[in-house]
Amino acid sequence: WELTILHTNDVHSRLEQTSEDSSKCVNASRCMGGVARLFTKVQQIRRAEPNVLLLDAGDQYQGTIWFTVYKGAEVAHFMNALRYDAMALGNHEFDNGVEGLIEPLLKEAKFPILSANIKAKGPLASQISGLYLPYKVLPVGDEVVGIVGYTSKETPFLSNPGTNLVFEDEITALQPEVDKLKTLNVNKIIALGHSGFEMDKLIAQKVRGVDVVVGGHSNTFLYTGNPPSKEVPAGKYPFIVTSDDGRKVPVVQAYAFGKYLGYLKIEFDERGNVISSHGNPILLNSSIPEDPSIKADINKWRIKLDNYSTQELGKTIVYLDGSSQSCRFRECNMGNLICDAMINNNLRHTDEMFWNHVSMCILNGGGIRSPIDERNNGTITWENLAAVLPFGGTFDLVQLKGSTLKKAFEHSVHRYGQSTGEFLQVGGIHVVYDLSRKPGDRVVKLDVLCTKCRVPSYDPLKMDEVYKVILPNFLANGGDGFQMIKDELLRHDSGDQDINVVSTYISKMKVIYPAVEGRIK
């Protein structure tokens, strides 16, 4: 019996088509992805093949102005229109709190939303009961398929799930649910979830009875043969894991941002064994036309976004200096504002011993592309912020050794004075440079804000200690020559849209007046 699994993950509000790097579409003839194009391909496959499932492995939320404005209603509406069969909860689905998940998505979705390792307690338990499920049995043709969901147990550190949701270990939580499916005579089981490729592989290895793993969170691109675009495969598609009980379990992921549609064909025998698995992600490029009815619906929903861009978010009573003359040479108050917003967006009081789980921010000065003048009545709009942060990136959470941070700060000034973008703006860090010294030896003092303390204070950086840092995804991926970050990072979790982080902070503060205060000397 042959099953076709179509899958997406980490779409992050890319409802409209995007350019090849998943930023705003500029030249339509070269654009990719978007729900209208996705629908065309999905329908094509549904017409051609008998047993098809369309699955999403989480993180539909967060990433563009679509989410900022519609807050998840857009996800429910367009996923319903595409007739998704199931979705797993990702960490970003909790970005607007549990209410921001329940009302727009859980109550509106016409498909099951799954996670076996999230357990509700207290007053939330009855409120959320039945709105998401540990698993769902879906009829597909003459057969039935069990889908069991999972979500990163790091979600409390990455988003805002509140105190009434417990995130259990994925493997521990999945096994009893899979066992339950087996007792219901369901012998074809897909684990659909959002914990990253390493955990996907572990689930394939450790959870008895899981036949296929469809994952997300790590934006992993897998491909067999010559890849069709710029993404470099992390392995073959599907990636085969040998389980502890000796079965070959296919593991798949489809990069991110709706650029690809994962396409996996599985042949099962009567016992539910995977006899064969093959496929590849399908690049959703302009050779695939956008579905006219979905496109018309997108255009209708788009109108509200254009209005939002010009509305006031808050006010500044000082000049926000985002000029390259400042931000690439010294501490600039736009850099301070952005870093403060980044830390504020990551406030998570999950442990009594820590005032917060992260205190540090670094930001390449070259990523700040415009100042904001306070003489326009102090008004700050989304449009203004889009000029400052035009690249559509995210502010991510990484774990780095102190020694890696030291290398990063040496790189920051290794060719100081040439107006290059690698000069770092900071938050929760005091750095002193001596530019008379030779490159690679210019950092003379590097103090960092403690986290395991009730009164935050600055302590010298310890080379062997592991620190959490918020930074742009551009830096996490080694941009501006920060190869040491990419090569040496111990953990990387993608975060919220850059503009959204700053806009939320400004809206929250109402009036801002960031200063230059001696973070960089």
């Epitope: 019996w1 057969e143 039935v144 025998d269 009567e270 016992r271 006899i275």
Partner: antibody
Framework: EVQLVQSGAEVKKPGASVKVSCKAS????????MNWVMQAPGQGLEWMGR????????FYSQKFKGRVTMTVDKSTSTVYMELSSLRSEDTAVYYC???????WGQGTTVTVSS | DIQMTQSPSSLSASVGDRVTITCRAS??????LNWLQQKPGKAPKRLIY???SLDSGVPSRFSGSGSGTEYTLTISSLQPEDFATYYC?????????FGGGTKVEIK
């Protein structure tokens, strides 16, 4: 649990036909295939062909083409294999086996003797 | 048709021995290969499917490997109940074809 139950032993004269049945249970019958495999006394296994339960589509091995007919009765989840123009070398145990031979019937002995 | 050449046709071994059986296909069969065990008077039983996946209930001393045209069944430590005849089966293309069988006997 998948189960395949075959009909009993048969003794046939050369030139006659034999029809062996295989009743399946424990799975969604219409979604799969059934294979038929022959094993002559003291010999190895030989694949005869397969039938798709849902629409009756068949694929026969060249060696048996023209003499073998596989049919399906969806209402009783039963598959049949008929072999005609029997000769002594058709004396064998005939097995039905699921799509990828994960489960087998107990075998039906067919003796062709004058 | 794809020919499956199985070797050896028979072997004698003792309990605890490591036993290796090979199947060579006349052309590339991907990993569309099963291994089956048959005891006298009984129907065959599948041990391994898709080259290396172990059927449920089959002891982990059985393992399969290979690719392209060369495939191997290994019994890491032969047990008394393992004395039987073993067959490979390719299902990459019609007609499906079995190897000639390997009879594993007690030394």
């Amino acid at each position: 649990e998948v189960q395949l139950v075959q009909s009993g032993a048969e003794v046939k004269k050369p030139g006659a036909s034999v029809k062996v049945s295989c009743k399946a249970s424990g799975y969604t019958f219409t979604a799969y295939f059934m294979n038929w495999v022959m094993q002559a006394p003291g010999q190895g296994l030989e694949w005869m062909g397969r039938i798709y339960h849902n629409n009756g589509d068949t694929f026969y091995s060249q060696k048996f083409k023209g003499r073998v007919t596989m049919t399906v009765d969806k209402s009783t989840s039963t598959v049949y294999m008929e072999l005609s123009s029997l000769r002594s070398e058709d004396t064998a145990v005939y097995y039905c086996a699921t799509s990828y031979v994960g489960d087998w019937g107990q075998g039906t002995t067919v003796t062709v003797s004058s | 048709d794809i020919q499956m050449t199985q070797s050896p046709s028979s072997l004698s071994a003792s309990v605890g021995d490591r036993v290796t059986i090979t199947c060579r296909a006349s052309q590339d069969i991907g990993d569309s290969l099963n291994w089956l065990q048959q005891k006298p008077g009984k129907a065959p039983k599948r041990l391994i499917y898709a080259t290396s996946s172990l059927d449920s209930g089959v002891p982990s001393r059985f393992s399969g490997s290979g690719s392209g045209t060369e495939y191997t069944l290994t019994i890491s430590s032969l047990q008394p109940e393992d004395f039987a005849t073993y067959y490979c089966l390719q299902y990459a293309s019609f007609p499906w074809t079995f190897g000639g069988g390997t009879k594993v006997e007690i030394k």
